[in-house]
Interface confidence: low
């Protein structure tokens, strides 16, 4: 059969699995004449064997492990043993099975644990190997925890991921391991070739030891100060420890305080450094820091309360020199004249603020003394014995002797007998017409002047005109301030006028006295009067409904896919034309009439999230007036960047020759997005032909190790290709070069001899 | 409460052996990495010999094959053989559970060797 199993001599790749008995030829080459026999040179490793007459078979099962491809070569001769045609490469690859276990690395792993430690971070990696092909399931490694021992009400606090092996602890271990109460567990950990999804998987277990050691940085407890301590400063007042000796401590007053009473030491220990003042700031919340010797935080800052405890060292105060309070005359017993109400900067709802209030002297103390009376702790004043009259004494002063728990204070009362309040105020005019105003007059103008004129006795409160609009201004756009001489109001603008929501407004003034009216009198229609304001249009620019418009799309969409839209109006009801400013990378375009954003070129979070550009909104026709807004658009990440080396790896060297095997470690990075656990890369050699010299073991997620698998290397520079996959989805592989001479080396460095100085590598191992 | 006492120090001649014990209490003694440090004036505090909970053991350059580390899980003590002391095996002598950097410590106990 010529084609599938014959054919003439040209280059040609089988795949043969491995384990497997032969049960077949590979392959029957025709010679072309003067080509009459056949020669198998290469990796034969004796298994592979080729008749004179062009017959290619295998003679014993292939073994991956050995060898993953061999490089064959046949070539035709002629009857003089001469080759006339090839040698061509017969490329065999040896398919893998799962004939080989995983094992662990250890058969024992310690490790130890912070209580409170943040969930899903790593403490400690487990590690199995398989000599099975990674890029196959038979390779493919699935760890598991079996047990945890302890076990607490069948919760588990520890987790391992399935891929890598890194342990961490679960949500509940955060919260609960306590090494008081358990200060130690074991896992029993299993992993399984075939991504652990087969019966016929093969497996391995390891146990762990875990000691939970204590986690002593926590925030104290809120402290008590007393203010104006007159011990000796500074005085420790909490203290914080970090879990590890070589902390510097260092405390963060958020609130940036003109003045921050509070130092640590390099113990930990907080001190107040000089006396503190309840009345100038009650509480104090800062923060503690623990940093390495680099500067750098070891953890989260604790919150640090001090509460500044009242002592009563302040007298009540009066609210002004003297208080003036009017009566009418003929008013009846009991009614209220005024309230005096004193201060006390004290604690509010302590002995220490609350007051007494007793009347100490009454002038004149005529038709009698004790005419008035004050409420003990609420300083109202009320008439006590009877009616006044202004003919007698048009005025009254009270001493009022105000007192706390320690001090007093003497606060001076004057009460002006007044006449009775039986006249309303009457406005001069009922009708103040209409008033057109445009809707961006400015606020704080006065638009209107109204006046309205009382009877009673002039300069008290029953004479008193007070000005309120009782209707027709809902939103409160305008306010009546009130001449005390003359009893003018002025109609003042206190928000601006909108044209679109209130154009014409009806308004309805009222004229009232503080005083009360006597009994039987009221207000009528002579206290009220009304007014009409029109606001006409003015031209406004449109208004977005947000300030700052987000969206959130993966930095791997469509060109043309929708990624947010703006949207905006003009309060005058025009159409409204969107555009685009600040587009700087030339991802998006915005539909004119609908504000929908659409993305027109590929996006990229590496080169920077969120892309902020400006949304321009401008009306149709009119004055054609715009406004700006915001869009921000957050790119999710993709995993889109290969691995690379983190940096720059020449100047590696071994001195030669080297006296046992050696190793040295590099990290990788990539520019995807790794949220809280970072990058878990997975390092093997990048190809097999390296493998006799060379081997890579992983140490953690992004650091490796390159070790020397003998002695025997050469003088010279050798590159060692290396293949790093960054296990995401879907997954990406770089494949990375490591430079690693071996020279001469004079005092631990490369030794070269004058005028051969260029690229001496630098690090040594 | 976590406990480790040193004993055993003391003054002895060049040449001449001690053993020292740390007994410690308030730990689950088996499970925990044990070792002995020490700390001579005006240096830093250095690894002497270390004991895993597995019992694999190592020692600094300076002490191979003149000290021994061992332990007895039972009595909840770890040892070290000291034998061909030197002057420069002076020094406050620490014993360590759990790694020097995450650990319990206890108070220290001195050992001079005089020439």
């Known amino acids: 059969q010529e084609g599938k199993f014959s054919g003439p001599l040209k280059p040609m790749t089988f795949s043969i699995y491995e384990g497997q008995e032969p049960s077949q030829i590979i392959f029957q080459f025709k010679a072309n004449p003067p080509a009459v026999t056949f020669e198998l040179t290469g990796e034969t490793d004796n298994i592979f064997v080729i008749e004179r007459e062009g017959l290619l078979y295998y003679n014993r099962a292939l073994d991956r492990e050995t060898r993953s491809t061999h490089n064959l070569q046949v070539a035709a001769l002629d009857a003089n043993g001469i080759i006339v045609e090839g040698p061509v490469p017969i490329t065999i690859k040896v398919k893998d099975i799962n004939d080989n276990r995983p094992t662990f690395l250890q058969s024992k792993y310690e490790g130890s644990v912070r209580q409170n430690s943040r969930p899903g971070k790593p403490f400690l990696y487990v590690n199995a190997t398989d000599l099975d092909d990674p890029a196959t399931p038979n390779g493919q490694l699935y760890y598991q925890i079996v047990i945890q021992l302890p076990m607490i009400n069948n919760v588990m606090y520890f987790q391992i991921n399935n891929k890598t092996g890194a342990i961490s602890l679960t949500r509940e271990g955060s919260q609960e391991l306590n090494p008081a109460k358990n200060p130690s567990y074991n896992l029993v950990i299993s992993v399984k070739d075939m991504g652990g999804q087969s019966e016929n998987s093969f497996s391995d277990t390891t146990s762990v030891d875990i000691i939970v050691t204590e986690n002593i940085w926590k925030a104290p407890k809120p402290v008590e100060m007393v203010e104006n301590s007159t011990d000796p400063h500074p005085i420790k007042i909490t203290q914080v420890r970090w879990n590890d000796p070589g902390a510097q401590y260092s405390l963060v007053d958020k609130e940036k305080l003109p003045r921050f009473p509070f130092s640590i030491d390099q113990e930990g220990d907080i001190y107040v450094t000089q006396p503190l003042d309840r009345e100038e700031k009650d509480a104090y919340v800062f923060y503690a820091v623990a940093k390495d010797e680099y500067g750098k935080p070891l953890s989260y800052p604790l919150e640090i309360h001090v509460k500044v405890k009242d002592i009563n060292d302040n007298p009540p105060t009066c609210p002004s020199p003297v208080t003036v309070f009017e009566v009418q005359e003929n008013e009846r017993l009991g009614n209220s004249i005024g309230t005096l109400t004193a201060h006390d900067r004290d604690e509010e709802n302590t002995a220490n603020s609350f007051l007494n209030y007793r009347i100490v002297e009454q002038t004149p103390k005529l038709p009698m003394d004790g005419l008035f009376l004050i409420q003990t702790y609420a300083g109202m004043l009320q008439l006590a014995k009877q009616s006044l009259k202004k003919q007698d004494t048009p005025q009254y002063n009270l001493t009022i002797e105000v007192s706390d728990k320690d001090f007093k204070t003497l606060c001076f009362v004057q009460i002006n007998v007044i006449d009775i309040n039986d006249q309303i105020p009457i406005f001069e005019k009922s009708d103040y017409g209409n008033l057109t105003l445009a809707e961006d007059t400015n606020i704080g103008s006065t638009i209107l002047t109204i006046q309205a004129t009382d009877a009673d006795e002039p300069f008290t409160g029953s004479s008193k005109i007070l000005y309120h609009i009782i209707k027709g201004d809902s939103e409160g756009r305008l306010g009546v301030d009130t001449d005390p001489h003359t009893n003018t109001g002025y109609v003042i603008i206190k928000k601006p006028l909108d044209f679109e929501t209130a154009a014409v407004s009806n308004i309805v003034f009222k004229a009232e006295n503080p005083e009360p009216l006597v009994f039987g009198v009221k207000y009528n229609a002579s206290s009220f009067a009304k007014f009409t304001l029109i606001v006409t249009d003015v031209n406004e620019a449109p208004q977005f409904s947000q300030h700052v418009f987000q969206a959130k799309v993966s930095e791997d969409v469509a060109i043309g896919t929708k990624v947010g839209n703006v949207t905006a109006k003009d309060p005058e009801g025009l159409d409204i034309s969107y555009s685009l400013r600040g587009d700087t990378r030339g991802w998006l375009k915005i539909d004119h009439v609908t504000g929908e954003i659409f993305s027109v070129a590929p996006l990229d979070r590496e080169a920077g999230s969120p892309y902020r550009v400006q949304v321009v909104a401008t009306e149709v026709g009119g004055s054609s007036l715009s406004s700006v807004s915001e869009f921000h658009l957050i790119l999710m990440d993709v995993n889109d960047n290969p691995p690379r080396l983190a940096k720059d790896y020449t100047g590696l060297f071994f001195c030669h020759p080297l006296s046992a095997p050696g190793s040295l470690i590099f990290e990788a990075t990539d520019d995807d997005q790794h949220l809280f656990r970072g990058p878990h890369f997975t390092f093997s050699l990048g190809s097999g032909s390296l493998q006799n010299d060379w081997e890579v073991s992983k140490i953690n997620g992004t650091h490796a190790r390159l070790s020397t698998r003998h002695t025997e290397f050469e003088e010279r520079e050798y590159v060692v290709l290396i293949r790093i996959n960054d296990g995401g989805r879907p997954p990406l592989e770089g494949i990375v070069s490591l430079p690693v001479t071996f020279c001469s080396c004079v005092e631990g460095s490369c030794f070269r001899p004058a005028g051969h100085q260029t690229g001496i590598p630098t690090v040594g191992m | 409460e976590v406990q480790l006492v040193e004993s055993g120090g003391g003054l002895v001649q060049a040449g001449g052996t001690l053993r020292l014990s740390c007994a410690a209490s308030?730990?689950?003694?088996?499970?925990?990495?044990l070792g002995w440090y020490r700390q001579a004036p005006g240096n830093q505090r250095e690894l002497v010999a270390n004991?895993?909970?597995?019992?694999?053991?190592s020692y600094a350059d300076s002490v191979k094959g003149r000290f021994t580390i061992s332990r007895d899980n039972a009595k909840n003590t770890v040892f070290l053989q000291m034998n061909n002391l030197k002057p420069e095996d002076t020094a406050v002598y620490y014993c360590?559970?759990?790694?020097?950097?995450?650990?319990?410590w206890g108070q220290g106990t001195q050992v001079t060797v005089s020439s």
């Open positions: 360590n559970a759990g790694g020097a950097r995450l650990g319990y």
């Open positions: 308030g730990i689950r003694f088996s499970f925990y990495a």
């Open positions: 004991m895993t909970s597995g019992g694999s053991t």
